[in-house]
């Protein structure tokens, strides 16, 4: 619609809306794949850089986490995946590329890397709410 | 044509609870975001809280032990309730819709004029 | 919480003259250049109407009499001119930061 402020400018207050949308998603989401795939650890291998570092508070980094929710989209709950990614397309700054990423090949490792991934998306979005819930913005 | 109707009772007991229900037509509350806001006596207006075409709900702080937002999405309806009610808490309350992010609330309902009063 | 101060909280100004409201937020409500402020209209018995959206924007429907301006924490809600369908009650109110907040009201007469 044209009454929509381009995804890139949405004030706090949005922000926030959307972080609520998303944090039961990615809860669930991760509750289910660690009842899924038990035993499976998290991979040191791999580090979502979720947050930006140029700004105060800090902003959820969109374009650097959604190419590995595309990434892992064919491997996981689709539907949740996909409710996800509509929710980090609004945040996502216009005009920012998205990087490839690849899955390891190895099936343990992939279930690592999913897994790392869930967990450290969940605490980002914590870490983010956080900083939207501290006063002042 | 979006439309929205607040109904409920007029009157509340001092320590009562007070529900009220918001009815939409022309739209769907499972899209978007659906707001209530109260208007003092003293004409002062004051932000409730909401409901996400989700369900998540998110209330302002100075409310948030008391209020409690929901809805029916087989009726399009949505809720408030206000447990603990105080004269203070007397006021013209009213639903409206928040369509758009960065955008304003662009249909709001008619009111309905609550007095808590023993 | 972000406060807003609207003045003058009453106006009386002749038809056909123009009428300026004031609205001012204890903290800045812009972000990337845009103001998430908005103005509505309350007419006696009835409920808020939106005018002007994002500090500056015109809601569909309502006349070019209305117009919004400002940034930062200065915003101003013009009508030129004023006509005897303008009677009312005019509040700003930001979106910029929960919880949302509106300013006090400022009631419009004719004189």
């Known amino acids: 619609s044209s009454h929509m402020a381009p995804t890139h400018q949405l004030p706090p207050s949005d922000v926030r809306k959307i972080i609520l949308e998303l944090q039961p998603l990615s809860r669930g989401l991760l509750e289910d794949y660690q009842k899924k795939e038990t035993g499976v650890p998290e991979s040191n291998r791999t580090l979502l850089l979720c947050l930006t570092s140029d700004s105060q508070p800090p902003r959820l980094n969109s374009s650097a986490i959604l190419p590995y929710f595309r990434a892992i989209r064919p491997l996981s709950d689709k539907n949740i995946i996909d409710k996800i990614i509509e929710q980090l397309d609004k945040l996502k700054f216009q005009h920012e590329p998205e990087t490839e990423i690849s899955v390891p090949a190895d099936t343990f490792e992939c279930k690592s890397f999913i897994l790392t991934i869930l967990q450290q998306f969940s605490a980002c979005l914590e870490s983010v709410f956080k900083s939207l819930n501290s006063g002042p913005q | 044509e979006v439309q929205l109707v607040e109904s409920g009772p007029s009157l509340v007991k001092p320590g009562g609870s007070l529900r009220l229900t918001c009815s939409v037509t022309?739209?769907?509350?499972?899209?978007?975001?659906w707001k209530w806001i109260r208007k003092f006596p003293g004409n002062k207006l004051e932000y409730m809280g909401y409901?996400?075409?989700?369900?998540?709900?998110d209330y302002n702080p100075s409310l948030k032990s008391r209020i409690t937002i929901s809805r029916d999405t087989s009726k399009n309806q949505y809720y408030l309730q206000l447990n603990s009610v105080t004269t203070e808490d007397t006021a013209t309350y009213y639903c409206?819709?928040?369509?758009?992010?960065?955008?304003?609330?662009?249909?709001w309902g008619q009111g309905t004029s609550v007095t808590v009063s023993s | 919480d972000i406060v807003m101060t609207q003045s003058p909280a009453s106006l009386s100004v002749s038809l056909g003259q123009r009428a300026t409201i004031s609205c001012r937020a204890s903290?800045?409500?812009?972000?990337?250049?845009?103001?998430?402020m908005h103005w509505y209209q309350q007419k006696p018995g009835q409920s808020p109407k939106l005018l002007i959206y994002r500090a500056s924007n015109l809601e569909s429907g309502i006349p070019a009499r209305f117009g919004g301006s400002g940034s930062g924490t200065d915003f101003t809600l013009t009508i030129d001119p004023v006509q005897a369908d303008d009677v009312a009650t005019y509040y700003c109110q930001q979106s910029y930061e929960d919880p949302w907040t509106f300013g006090g009201g400022t009631k419009l007469e004719i004189k």
């Open positions: 409901i996400s075409y989700s369900g998540i709900t």
């Open positions: 409206a819709r928040y369509g758009n992010y960065g955008y304003a609330m662009d249909y």
């Open positions: 903290e800045s409500v812009d972000t990337y250049g845009r103001s998430f």
């Open positions: 022309g739209d769907s509350i499972t899209s978007g975001y």
